[in-house]
């Protein structure tokens, strides 16, 4: 939602967290601001304090409950407001009617581990974190592998078009250090975006057996 020169963007992690970023040109530096969430069909409301992340941008997380509790559904609409202190009052700086399941960004996948590693192959598994049971199997993943001498940006993306929490990396170089990352996205939601990348998992392929053809 945009008001004046302000941009207000929020995402729901599908369980109990709404993360918001508010940016504004020439915003007051010393003002206390917060995000306030008012669901249309729930008894609770929630507030978080916006903290600076850059010169003209602030962020905060609305914690709606226990991490794995299902606090919102596809029919919920949450009025989200940015409020900034002026004198003793609060001023509404931005407002949006937020449809949580149209604005999804899941938590980064966790518990990455090497299941099996060979000279040219590596099987890696992971878990999704705090993802709603509503998705059933309607998730997709992207993965990337960092090779020596390259950057993450140069790494080709591997797409898994189904809920598959493992991958077998092939055509790897023996006795070489690699790093691996994965991210997840629900298929649902007009403004849904990819989760952050997982923490990188470092692994090393096995050296080629001495005196054998590789």
């Amino acid at each position: 939602a945009v008001n004046g020169t302000s941009q207000f963007t929020c995402f729901y992690n599908s369980r109990a967290n709404i993360s918001c970023v508010w940016s504004q040109d020439g915003a007051l530096q010393d003002t206390s601001c917060q995000v306030h969430a008012w669901p249309d069909r729930r008894r609770w409301n929630q507030t978080c304090e916006l903290l600076p992340v850059s010169q003209a941008s602030w962020a905060c997380n609305l914690i709606l409950g226990a991490p794995d509790s299902q606090k919102l559904t596809t029919v919920d609409i949450v009025t989200l407001r940015v409020l900034c202190r002026e004198g003793v009052r609060w001023r509404v700086m931005a407002i949006q009617d937020f449809k949580p399941f149209e604005n999804l960004r899941l938590m980064a996948p966790i518990s990455l581990q090497v299941v099996h590693v060979e000279t040219h192959r590596c099987n890696i598994s992971w878990e999704i974190s705090q993802a709603s049971h509503y998705f059933e199997r309607h998730l997709e993943f992207e993965a990337r592998t960092l090779s020596p001498g390259h950057t993450w940006e140069e790494a080709p993306l591997l797409t898994l078009k189904q809920k598959q929490e493992w991958i077998c990396l092939e055509t790897l170089t023996p006795d070489t250090q690699y790093e691996f990352q994965v991210r997840v996205k629900p298929l649902q939601g007009e403004f849904t975006t990819w989760s952050p990348w997982s923490q990188p998992l470092a692994f090393r392929t096995k050296p080629a057996a001495l005196g054998k053809d590789t």
Partner: antibody, heavy 121, light 112 residues
Framework: EVQLVQSGAEVKKPGASVKVSCKAS????????ISWVRQATGQGLEWMGE????????YYNEMFKGRVTMTRDTSISTAYMELSSLRSEDTAVYYC??????????????WGQGTTVTVSS | DVVMTQTPLSLPVTLGQPASISCRSS???????????LEWFQQRPGQSPRLLIY???NRFSGVPDRFSGSGSGTDFTLKISRVEAEDVGVYYC?????????FGGGTKVEIK
Amino acid sequence: EVQLVQSGAEVKKPGASVKVSCKASGYTFTDYVISWVRQATGQGLEWMGEIYPGDGNTYYNEMFKGRVTMTRDTSISTAYMELSSLRSEDTAVYYCARGSYTYDNYAMDFWGQGTTVTVSS
Amino acid sequence: DVVMTQTPLSLPVTLGQPASISCRSSQNIVHSNGNTYLEWFQQRPGQSPRLLIYKVSNRFSGVPDRFSGSGSGTDFTLKISRVEAEDVGVYYCFQGSHIPWTFGGGTKVEIK
């Protein structure tokens, strides 16, 4: 029905202090701000500052800082405005007015009847 | 501080005729949230001020539709389409965009 009832007229000597009260009814006192506005005889309106009774937080117009103190007593839904070091230019009608804690639309919707303060030697 | 200047100081009008009051601010009063917090108050003789218009053109509850507000940036206008006897009094513009909030000097509406 929202009502703000103010204390009666006061006559004060220069250098003295005056304390004006504003009793609220017909709404939840701690949910709204109380602003104070003054109007010198034959003059315009001047916003002095305000208090949020919910937490006692105050904000004063720089013009009155150091001389004005706004307080409240939530047990009797009453706000107070005290002005010290009075001079003849402070002769005015002092109004309290209610305002929304979140300034969405307007600053002040309901006003008290006003309290006349006369500063004279 | 934002200075609000009203014209005219005095406005003699005929019952049933329109009236127009101008208010000019010394700087733009568009708030950084994109809204313009320009309000109009009416003060009848011997009474407290009463809110008529907020955010330039919105009528407060119970205000007759003969009152209308318009304008943007630094120039604003209050119009009374057909003046009635009960409209006599002083009208003040007010800006709530920049602290300290400030009032105009007032325009006295009287019947000719």
